[in-house]
Every structure is written in structure tokens, then in C-alpha cells.
Amino acid sequence: FGISGRHSITVTTVASAGNIGEDGILSCTFEPDIKLSDIVIQWLKEGVLGLVHEFKEGKDELSEQDEMFRGRTAVFADQVIVGNASLRLKNVQLTDAGTYKCYIITSKGKGNANLEYKTGAFSMPEVNVDYNASSETLRCEAPRWFPQPTVVWASQVDQGANFSEVSNTSFELNSENVTMKVVSVLYNVTINNTYSCMIENDIAKATGDIKVTESEIKRRSHLQLLNSKA
């Protein structure tokens, strides 16, 4: 097809982060076209010669795909017609981090937008009471983090208190030699209090809470990606 007229279409991307070894999404939307066959999606990465992915005439066109992305990319083909050019990236690698460009061609015109993609490892922490310890102790564990995060303890009762003197954090390299298991132990715990174990690196922030009373233990954890609207 040919593009007539001088029009640029709006393309929107969202910065995001990928968890090493898992699947990730590079988000991109555009002004939709009425004919799927008139839409071309090209994903590029700065520093990479070949294409990350190309979708044209209603199907993948991978003849110019770069070797490092071979077999790892897919668009949501059924959603392209409504303006979704997001890319699914399988088995995210540390080296997938960088600047990507989502480049769109339709019968209405062309447009592109860049996005920053960070890669690392992040996981939910679980906080438990360590009954084996000589004193009341909490143990916070998270299986996969990279780069090495910081761990900070906080408590609801002693707000603003510094627990660094009564806690000990260790990082154990996992078998794939990239990610690490995070273990942090908090000593001298008092009951009828809620403690939080906060793990953070430049990609994600995760918190594990534990409420310890005489009658019950309640746990809660959540994780948020940083510098990302995803």
C-alpha cells in the first residue's frame, strides 16, 4: 500500500519493567485503522541492528528480526485492528533492557514513540515468625531480586524507628547466577504490633506486612514497579 498525504498518527508507549526469566509486555497503542492489511508495526531497539519484531499485512514478518529476539516476540494480533501494538516478550533477559521504538504505519500516516524498558528480578516477600530463634524473631524472605535491593524494617507502633541495629539481611545467589534470594531477620519483636519488611531496588518496591497479636498472625504483601505507569 502507499501512504497519501502528509499525516502523522499518535503513538503512545508506557515505560515498563520486565522480570528476568518471565514474560514481559512492551506497551504501545496507536490510532486504529479500518483495514488490518494497511497496518505495519515495527519494534526497534537502540543498539540492535535487526528488528525486534515486525507485523504487516495481518501477520508477523520476521525476515529482518534480530537474532537476539528470535522466537521470543509476539504482538496481540487480534487487537492490532483496535490500535494495540503492544509486544509480548518471552523469557525476559537482563540484556533486553534499553530504549525501544514502536513504529507504526497505517493508511492514515505514520507515527512512533520510544519507551524505556528496565529488566531485573522482583518478587513478593513473605514474613513469618521464626519460632526456632531464641527470642521473638521475624524472618522476611523473597526468592528473586536483581539488582541487589535494600531492605528496611518498619513498625506501626515504633514509627520512624531505625531497625538496622536489630536486623540482619543476607543475599544468596540463585542457581542461574544472576538473581538473588533475599533473607532479612528482625530480632526483639514485640507482640501486638505490625511490622513491615520493605525491599526495594531501582525497578520495584515490595512490602511484606505481618501483624502479630496474642491470638493471631495476619500477613499481607504487595509489589509495585517503579518509574512505570503499568
Partner: antibody
Amino acid sequence: EVQLVESGGGVVQPGRSLRLSCAASGFTFSSYSMNWVRQAPGKGLEWVSAISGSGGSTYYADSVKGRFTISRDNSKNTLYLQMNSLRAEDTAVYYCARKRWYGMDVWGQGTTVTVSS
Amino acid sequence: SYELTQPPSVSVAPGKTARITCGGNNIGSKSVHWYQQKPGQAPVLVVYDDSDRPSGIPERFSGSNSGNTATLTISRVEAGDEADYYCQVWDSRTYVFGTGTKLTVL
């Protein structure tokens, strides 16, 4: 300041070899693909070769395939072009240029290669 | 292989508008970049992605691209704009440059 400085040009006999270098500064060299582009006297621009940021992927123009080799040393922020079996038609000013998506946004000042007997 | 055709020369009076064309099969579906090269100097990117300008390039330089023709437009031409201009696209793992146009300011 982003800068590219080529060196290694000179006069060489047909069939001989020459290695060009391009020293980069002012940017994260390993994050960018790089190119060599040449310009024969009084002629237009001709793309020669490209290399990915990691150095793991390379492309060549048909006119130099099998004779020229592009490489890089990211620890030294340097791009190279090894030119073997040189011919008279390889006589040109050789520029290194930083690849930015589908274009080239930063160019060196060029180094002159003359192939003559 | 993909080919880009430019007029060998374009002449324009100072203060007027110069238009340099770059022809290629369905070039409108490609991203076109334009370079300015003055005698004895390295090329300088003046327009990228059809119509965007790098920082430091005057607003007088603009580009468009549709169908089989991309166009570099230089408005209010100055004597310092006299140079060779090249268009460029990426096609099938190859950078393709246009044949070049010499802009003469009368």
C-alpha cells in the same frame, strides 16, 4: 560533547590491507550500533557496514562483503574496520557514524584511504 | 536493491524556498532522513523520521514524505545553506543513500 574521531587512513597498494579506527567519546558507546560510510572523490555517500552495540551482529554492503570486517572494543570505546584485498574503487573518505534508529545522528570528520600502485 | 533518486542540482535565490526531492518505490512507507554536507566536511543530519529536526537545526529545514516521493524543504534560504544534500532510508538490512543534490544559492 559527543564525538567520533577516525584514524588509520593512508595510501596502500591494491591487494593490501588497512585497519581504520574510530574513537568515540561523550556517550555510552556500547548502547549504540555503529556504521562505516564512505565517499569516493567527487561521488556520493555509500554505506559500508554496521555493527550492533554488543558487537554480536554485523551487516555489510555487497561491495565489501568478504573483504571488510567491522568490529568494536566497547572497553576502549573504539570502532574498527579491517579492510583486506583492497581495490582502487575502495579509494574514499571513510566516516564512522552512530546509528540512531533508521538514521545516523553523529559523524566523525573522516579519514582518507587511497588505494594506488 | 532499493534505489533513491535525487535531482543532481537545485538552484534558488536567497530568501526563497528550496525543495529537494527524493524518489523511491513506495518511499512513503519508509522513514526518510536527510543529511547536509558542505565541501570538505562530514555530513550533518538535518531531518530525521521524514519531518523531525535534530536540536540545533533551524526551523527553516522541514521534510515530508508520501507516496513515492520524500521532500526536503528549506525556507528563507541563506548563502550558508549551499551544500550537497542526501536522503537516506533503511531497506532490507542495508542503508541506502540517495544520489545527492547540490543546492546552489544564486
